[in-house]
């Protein structure tokens, strides 16, 4: 899934490093390959044999402000006949990401990197069968 | 830009928008999250489209490892455990946002950089094209 | 915090070999990228080199080819070896560490290299 894009300008670069706090990090959010495309198969959410559909999450104090998040259609797996086969796991794969959380406090302004574990999609796999004695 | 809700008794001279550079604390919140999709499942070699993961490292980028999924195969494993070539294996991508040290080698300054990574594969029906 | 103390600076002549080294001890949760920097006297602090934990490496211009950064992850130490010293290449030696949790650089408070002609 693509990261929605915010507009902005590109600034030169300074050669030297600016100076910044102790304790802090200097951050430009003007974001590097912001136009590279994602290119991938289509429908896979739709033709996979683990389906599943997407949620926009919005937060107007993150950036970016919109993550999409997968969840996984089924507990089984779409078997050739169409139908659900709970011999199989659908289950969710997962990624980390970096946001930044804009916090107030009073009227004061804060800024804060966050990672956040978002779910792009769904496999289906073998279950992990547990024996019992 | 983004719109940020401000406190109404506050001063109006805060921007309403994300500013372009900002100073963020060093600590990362919610960082306990694992970072090695080796160690957090093994959905890699179970899946019915099984994929490998390479590590692509580098030191002027945080987090400076990131995994990259590989699909083994071009079908899926079937119920018997051979691959079936009427199924296909695909990488699912998803855009992240890392940093990347700027200007270069700067040692506490950073601007977002998006990549494309594959996190894993998933087993999909072929999309079947016929020839008049 | 992340604690890291330098050793090794010295005085040296031109087209000589130093070696640094620098361990990280304190709170060493998972010490990520390990990095050396210089300051020569009224300059700004330059970087030299990263080493990330797989050992993947990054070098300046200025010094690719002459100096070579290594590390020993069960010691939390990095070492610069320093070959074909310059008199430019005088200055204080700091090695920096950023944690597997975040990106901030923690620093030592470095060693003095002088290279005499």
């Known amino acids: 899934r693509k990261i929605p894009k915010v507009g902005h300008t590109f600034f030169q670069k300074p050669e030297s490093c600016p100076p910044v706090p102790g304790g802090s990090m200097k951050l430009d959010i003007g974001i590097i390959n912001e136009n590279q495309r994602v290119s991938m198969s289509r429908n896979i959410e739709s033709r996979s044999t683990s389906p599943w559909n997407y949620t926009v999450t919005w937060d107007p104090n993150r950036y970016p402000s919109e993550v999409v998040q997968a969840q996984c259609r089924n507990l089984g797996c779409i078997n050739a006949q169409g139908k659900e086969d709970i011999s199989m796991n659908s289950v969710p794969i997962q990624q980390e990401t970096l946001v930044v959380r804009r916090k107030h406090q009073g009227c004061s302004v804060s800024f804060q990197l966050e990672k956040v574990l978002v779910t792009v999609g769904c496999t289906c796999v073998t279950p992990v069968i547990h024996h019992v004695q | 830009g983004i719109t940020i809700p401000r406190n109404p008794g506050c001063p109006n001279s805060e921007d309403k928008n994300f500013p372009r550079t900002v100073m963020v604390n060093l600590n990362i919140h919610n960082r306990n999250t694992n970072t090695n999709p080796k160690r957090s499942s093994d959905y890699y070699n179970r899946s019915t489209s099984p994929w490998n993961l390479h590590r692509n490292e580098d030191p002027e980028r945080y987090p400076s490892v990131i995994w990259e999924a590989k699909c083994r195969h071009l079908g899926c494993i079937n119920a018997d455990g051979n691959v079936d070539y009427h199924m296909n294996s695909v990488p699912i991508q998803q855009e992240i946002l890392v940093l990347r040290r700027e200007p270069p080698h700067c040692p506490n300054s950073f601007r977002l950089e998006k990549i494309l990574v594959s996190v894993g594969c998933t087993c999909v029906t072929p999309i079947v094209h016929h020839v008049a | 915090e992340v604690q890291l103390v330098e050793s090794g600076g010295g005085l040296v002549q031109a087209g000589g070999s130093l070696s640094l080294s620098c361990a990280a001890s304190?709170?060493?949760?998972?010490?990520?990228?390990m990095r050396w920097h210089r300051q020569a006297p009224g300059k700004q602090r330059e970087f030299l080199a990263s080493?990330?934990?797989?050992?993947?490496?990054n070098y300046a211009d200025s010094v690719k080819g002459r100096f070579t950064i290594s590390r020993d992850n069960a010691k939390n130490t990095v070492y610069l070896q320093m070959n074909s010293l310059k008199p430019e290449d005088t200055a204080v030696y700091y090695c920096?560490?950023?944690?597997?949790?975040?990106?901030?650089?923690?620093w030592g408070l470095g060693t003095q290299v002088t290279v005499s002609s």
């Open positions: 304190g709170s060493v949760f998972r010490i990520d990228v």
């Open positions: 920096g560490a950023n944690a597997e949790s975040g990106p901030y650089t923690y």
């Open positions: 080493i990330a934990s797989g050992g993947t490496t």
